[in-house]
């Protein structure tokens, strides 16, 4: 069971999924991707206060040590817990192909 | 293959494994763990400059978008890529037991 989903910093301030629209130029993909020409990137953004969406024991330890030694140990970080696949039409050596990438779009977020 | 392992910020400044010594009291474990009484916590600490130890395509995207929109998109974060198990002697309802935790000590780090 995931640890606390209540954000003590206020609504939307803690680690959660955000969508950021980006062009192929923004991503540096214009030279090899043909479609889609705008990518809706889902990514994990937000703070990870004590025990909020702690991914595992390591995240809990990190929270404790950050409280004790904030200059040495960083707070847990908001990162993808899982991914959604994404299809791209891309250039290849022989022409064009559809390629699915499994590690491109965040599906779910946690703190670690 | 992992992206660049050369740290442009100088030796030891980028995302890598660190060992932090912590007592059971530091970790808030004194009431349920009997041994070890000092834990050498391996954790991932350090900066994630462009493409340094990028875990996957998502990390590469995050780098690109952070460069474009630093106030909206955070830089990739240094987190465990894998873990080492750790055995704790802990109190139980019926006495004492040895318990192995698989997600406690970082083994390897990457940026995501």
């Amino acid at each position: 069971a995931r640890n606390g989903d209540h954000c003590p910093l206020g609504p939307g301030r803690c680690c959660r999924l955000h969508t950021v629209r980006a062009s192929l130029e923004d991503l540096g993909w214009a030279d090899w991707v043909l479609s889609p020409r705008e990518v809706q990137v889902t990514m994990c953004i937000g703070a990870c206060p004590s025990q909020f969406r702690a991914a595992n024991m390591h995240a809990q330890i990190k929270t404790s040590l950050h409280r004790l030694k904030p200059d040495t140990v960083p707070a847990p970080c908001c990162v993808p817990a899982s991914y959604n696949p994404m299809v791209l039409i891309q250039k290849t050596d022989t022409g064009v192909s559809l390629q699915t990438y499994d590690d491109l779009l965040a599906k779910d977020c946690h703190c670690i | 293959a992992r992206n660049g392992d050369h740290c442009p910020l100088g030796p030891g400044r980028c995302c890598r494994l660190h060992t932090v010594r912590a007592s059971l009291e530091d970790l808030g474990w004194a009431d349920w763990v009997l041994s070890p009484r000092e834990v050498q916590v391996t954790m991932c600490i350090g900066a994630c400059p462009s493409q340094f130890r990028a875990a996957n395509m998502h990390a590469q995207i995050k780098t690109s978008l952070h460069r474009l929109k630093p106030d909206t998109v955070p830089a990739p974060c240094c987190v465990p890529a894998s873990y080492n198990p750790m055995v704790l002697i802990q109190k139980t309802d019926t006495g004492v037991s040895l318990q192995t935790y698989d997600d406690l000590l970082a083994k390897d780090c990457h940026c995501i």
Epitope: S35, T42, N84, I89 | -
Partner: antibody, heavy 119, light 112 residues
């Protein structure tokens, strides 16, 4: 192999709202890059792109229909839906749902459902 | 909106013989990346349309190599090198350069 299946009433009265649902099986609607699209074909005529939705809920509509169209997605049910308000006889058509990469490469289509607007 | 015009409206063909369909757009479909954003579809009698060609000249998965797409800018051609009985139906070109994507009026291919 992804399959798409349209469902909804085959007869709608003028001025009412046409509602259709497309159920996706054999794959997740949560796949990025794909735009889940509605296209229609008037009897004996050509094809008209109505609009599309991304799994995140972002939509794009044909300007000629925009004031009357709403496309929504329910990722938990692996479905997306079309609502077309204030219909007239001119909206009588076979309605297809399809999967495209952005506005192109519609490589998966539903079998189509005929909707007749009549009193 | 970009207007797509196809010719001929109807094309009687002899099995084993070649066939050619023309498609013209009201503005250039050539993207700055060098690719033409045009698809070709075939709608067989009583069926949904099926993708034949995308990005002007790339055959979709499973499409026989007797189908080929060519052209650039505003003038495009779909060729069938040797027509087979199963190729009958209505062929549509579709511009995919910008929203809304628009279809040509269709070319009906029938056996003589």
């Amino acid at each position: 192999q992804v399959q798409l299946q349209e469902s909804g009433p085959g007869l709608v009265k003028p001025s009412q709202t046409l509602s259709l649902t497309c159920t996706v099986s054999g794959g997740s609607i949560n796949s990025g890059g794909y735009y889940w699209t509605w296209i229609r074909q008037h009897p004996g005529k050509g094809l008209e792109w109505i609009g599309a939705i991304y799994y995140s809920g972002s939509t794009v509509y044909n300007p000629s229909l925009k004031s009357r169209v709403t496309i929504s997605v329910d990722t938990s049910k692996n479905q997306f839906s079309l609502k077309l308000s204030s219909v007239t006889a001119a909206d009588t058509a076979v309605y297809y749902c399809a999967r495209g990469v952005e506005y192109q490469h519609f490589n998966e289509w539903g079998q189509g459902t005929l909707v007749t607007v009549s009193s | 909106d970009i207007v797509m015009t196809q010719s001929p409206l109807s094309l009687p063909v002899t099995p084993g013989e070649p066939a050619s369909i023309s498609c013209r757009s009201s503005q250039s479909l050539l993207h700055s990346n060098g690719y033409n954003y045009l698809d070709w579809y075939l709608q067989k009698p009583g069926q949904s349309p099926q993708l034949l060609i995308y990005l002007g000249s790339n055959r979709a998965s499973g499409v026989p190599d007797r189908f080929s797409g060519s052209g650039s800018g505003t003038d495009f051609t779909l060729k069938i090198s040797r027509v087979e009985a199963e190729d009958v139906g209505v062929y549509y070109c579709m511009q995919t350069l910008e929203a809304p994507p628009t279809f040509g009026g269709g070319t009906k291919v029938e056996i003589k």
